[in-house]
């Protein structure tokens, strides 16, 4: 059958029918339904929601909907022995204690099973000592403390403000600095936008609000006890001492009312510069310890959380492809939340639900996609991307042979200013073309395309007239698909104006105040931004699953490879004498990029000209496109990070949320001037250039004519 026979309706009509079926009112209704009670991973409530979604996806018309369960390591506070932090006097008496819970928002006072704020996977402990304020606890913050200010964090409890980087990186940095405990807090400078009221009167964080979150350093491993393999019924589990990525020191999060009480007494060194000052009325002294009058007082942490192997449930829905059922386009987002999940994840889950409903409607009318679409509701994302990673580990052989693309669907909104897209360069043209066909929901852009408002509000720093598209990092469920398996991936959501709102994420992130009302009252009352995100995510899935030739442009990879090579060479050029001394050359990498550019260009010409009615040739060309992302995978992985295998992109070693290009070379060059053995260090740079050059060349050759 030709594609059009199989799919029963002309392609253009299909896409329009699919998009027209998406309704803002339905997304609103689904969001409400998903946010009335907490859905913490590993709880009965989240299992019940999984079964509800399974049932509804079946009703919507999917061919099959199954639950996939795994038994993974999760972490919970002790219900009878709460976590808190004290200031103790010289006699050991607790003269101040941090709060044990967030004041519940109006209308939710009688909801049970609201997990109190905690840092998931913190070990138990009751360390006491002097406090050191470490700003955001970034690598550069510890460099400033240790190298410039000569402040030793060894044996100290450090207090760090949330923001800028993933909290797990903060904890890792504190551990490496010798700290014996970490207090994380939300500073109003980062989580309170000027001119906006606190929840429930606005979308700002109140003083009693606290950000929950895991503090793992998994580096893509999934379940800490079964790295590389699914946590199934017959799994061999590591002992807790050998578990991947667990922190070794107690960690606990607090709000800014409690932080004020700890920071106002700080003595020792003054902050090194204004970038270390937040918005509290405190001096932001670095310490160590409290100022004169309070110098005999110490800080004590009381952490009693436990790690427990717990069952989790993914929901996997299948819509079988009519022509290429063995080619998979995946739309996935998580279902588990810290509390109500008003934004994270249910604003995304509601969009996925509506996308499934629309596809189901088309299917009931006799349509099928060309390729198979898989829909996933992941569990335990908040505990380290566990559900998605375990499923991908279980199905890795199928995915690496059949996976066309993965589209992520966590929070649909983190603001209501403009679109934000992170994706593989293969999808740039798909995103551009799709957004040109969609209407902008933005005020002042009535009758204009989404592409136009997006480009105006978020212009590309390199190419005029084009929007910014960012690199994929991590911190979400695309990680295993992209960074480990090399499946082309992308994500889209509505975001804030980063230029005027410099707070990190959105203020109520991972707090009890992330409710349905937060979205309905303050972010998107008409659900028009949610609808737009549904159109972008759904439209991408539709095109990827239905276009005869895969909508990937390999020439865009060539452009970014040249840019990334130029960037990494520029970093290396800061050490020109060492490059000369150790004969460090990037010529092999630039040569490989040049070859890639030429071969990609020739491939694109052939793609225009080949006989698309010949199914064998069509499949051959599509396979070359599908496997291009796979060709950037190094089976040996990155140094000390075996599950990060993509040579072009990896999560930054200093911030899991951020993507780094040519990460192997980047990490080898990082802080190279401080290495004790420069010859060895520069040898590793040369080795990483070799790996990168080889990989780019090998990827290029997959696009060459096959014979």
């Amino acid at each position: 059958k030709s594609s059009n026979e199989a799919t029963n309706i002309t392609p253009k009509h299909n896409m329009k029918a699919f998009l027209d079926e998406l309704k803002a009112e339905n997304i609103k209704k689904f969001l409400y339904n998903f946010t009335q009670i907490p859905h913490l991973a590993g709880t009965e409530q989240n299992f019940q929601l999984a079964k509800q979604i399974q049932s509804q996806w079946k009703e919507f018309g999917l061919d099959s909907v199954e639950l996939a369960h795994y038994d993974v390591l999760l972490s919970y506070p002790n219900k009878t022995h709460p976590n808190y932090i004290s200031i103790i006097n010289e006699d050991g008496n607790e003269i101040f204690n941090t709060s044990l819970f967030e004041p519940p928002p109006p209308g939710y006072e009688n909801v049970s099973d609201i997990v109190p704020p905690f840092s998931a996977f913190s070990p138990q402990g009751m360390p006491e000592g002097d406090l050191v304020y470490v700003n955001y606890a970034r690598t550069e913050d510890f460099f400033k403390l240790e190298r410039d200010m000569k402040i030793n964090c060894s044996g100290k409890i450090v207090i760090a403000r949330y923001g800028k980087v993933f909290r797990g990186n903060k904890v890792k940095n504190a551990q490496l600095a010798g700290a014996k405990g970490v207090i994380l807090y939300s500073d109003p400078a980062d989580y309170f936008a000027p001119g906006v009221k606190s929840y429930p009167d606005g979308w700002n964080l109140p003083g009693g609000g606290v950000q929950r979150g895991n503090i793992l350093n998994l580096n893509g491993a999934g379940d800490p006890l079964t790295p590389g393999y699914p946590a199934n019924e017959y799994a061999y589990r590591r002992g807790i001492a050998e578990a991947v990525g667990l922190p070794s020191i107690p960690v606990h999060p607090i709000g800014y009312y409690d932080a004020q009480k700890l920071l106002e007494k700080m003595g020792g060194s003054a902050p090194p510069d204004s970038s270390w000052r937040g918005s509290l009325k405190v001096p932001y002294n670095v310490g160590p310890g409290f100022t004169g009058n309070f110098s005999t007082q110490k800080v004590k942490m009381h952490i009693h959380s436990t790690n427990e192997v717990t069952r989790i449930y993914n929901v996997i829905g299948t819509l079988r492809g009519a022509v290429e059922p063995d080619r998979y386009v995946i739309l996935g987002g998580h279902r588990d939340s810290w509390v109500f999940g008003g934004i994270d994840p249910q604003s995304g889950a509601a969009v996925v639900h509506e996308i499934v409903r629309s596809f189901g409607t088309l299917k009931k009318e006799g349509w099928r996609p060309r390729r198979t679409i898989l829909f996933a509701s992941w569990d335990a994302e908040e505990f380290g991307l566990l559900g998605s990673t375990e499923w991908a580990e279980e199905n890795s052989r199928l995915l690496q042979e059949r996976g066309v693309a993965y589209i992520n669907a966590d929070s649909s909104i983190e603001g209501n200013y403009t679109l934000r897209v992170d994706c593989t360069p293969l999808m740039y043209s798909l995103v551009h073309n799709l957004t040109k066909e969609l209407k902008s929901p933005d005020e002042g852009f009535e009758g204009k395309s989404l592409y136009e408002s997006w480009t105006k509000k978020s212009p590309s720093p390199e190419f005029s007239g084009m929007p910014r598209i960012s690199k994929l990092g991590s911190g979400n469920d695309f990680e295993v698909f992209f960074q480990r398996l090399g499946i082309a991936s992308g994500r889209a959501r509505y975001t804030k104006n980063w230029e005027t709102n410099k707070f990190s994420g959105y203020p109520l992130y991972h707090s009890v105040y992330e409710t349905y009302e937060l979205v309905e009252k303050f972010y998107d009352p008409m659900f028009k931004y949610h609808l737009t995100v549904a159109q972008v995510r759904g439209g991408m899935v539709f095109e990827l699953a239905n276009s005869i030739v895969l909508p990937f442009d390999c020439r865009d990879y060539a452009v970014v490879l040249r840019k990334y090579a130029d960037k990494i060479y520029s970093i290396s050029m800061k050490h020109p004498q060492e490059m000369k001394t150790y004969s460090v050359s990037f010529d092999s990498l630039f040569s490989a990029v040049k070859n890639f550019t030429e071969i990609a260009s020739k491939f694109s010409e052939r793609l225009q000209d080949f006989d698309k009615s010949n199914p064998i040739v069509l499949r051959m060309m599509n396979d070359q496109l599908m496997f291009l992302e796979r060709a950037f995978i190094d089976p040996l992985g990155l140094p000390d990070r075996p599950f990060y295998r993509h040579v072009i992109y990896a999560p930054s070693s200093h911030n899991k949320y951020a993507g780094e290009s040519f990460p192997g070379i980047y990490d080898a060059l990082f802080d190279i001037e401080s290495k004790v053995d420069p010859s060895k260090a520069w040898g590793e740079v040369k080795r990483q250039i070799y790996v990168a050059a080889f990989t780019v060349q090998a990827a290029a050759e997959t696009l060459s004519e096959v014979a």
């Epitope: 720093p461 520029s570 050029m573 630039f590």
Partner: nanobody
């Protein structure tokens, strides 16, 4: 032929200014980062500054921050280094370095000597 030619060097007193130029030919200048590197007499090579593609982003070695400014005129295929408040320790041969749009090897100019002396 891909070529970089520096000019503008000379002898100058401490505290005064100089502006170095680097004219590029034979490649698409606007597309890529450009660098200034210097070598003081009897010393090794030292990176001074980098300016990225469109000229909006630049970086400097700590010792010249606030005194040197790198810029580029993509229309004229020229790179500049404005050096203010010069010090004796800025005495060096200054090289511009770049990579053409299709060149595999980096291109170095022949250098221009700057001597800061009273």
């Amino acid at each position: 032929e891909v070529q970089l030619v520096e000019s503008g060097g000379g002898v100058v007193q401490p505290g005064r200014s100089l502006r170095l130029s680097c004219a590029a030919s034979g490649f698409t200048f606007s597309s890529y980062a450009m660098h200034w590197v210097r070598q003081a007499p009897g010393k090794g090579l030292e990176w001074v500054a980098t300016i990225y593609q469109d000229g909006s982003e630049s970086e400097y070695v700590d010792s010249v921050k606030g005194r040197f400014t790198v810029s580029r005129d993509n229309a004229k295929n020229t790179l500049y280094l404005q050096m203010d408040s010069l010090r004796a320790e800025d005495t060096a041969t200054y090289y511009c370095v770049g990579r053409g749009s299709t060149s595999i090897t980096p291109v170095w100019g022949l250098g221009t000597l700057v001597t800061v002396s009273s």
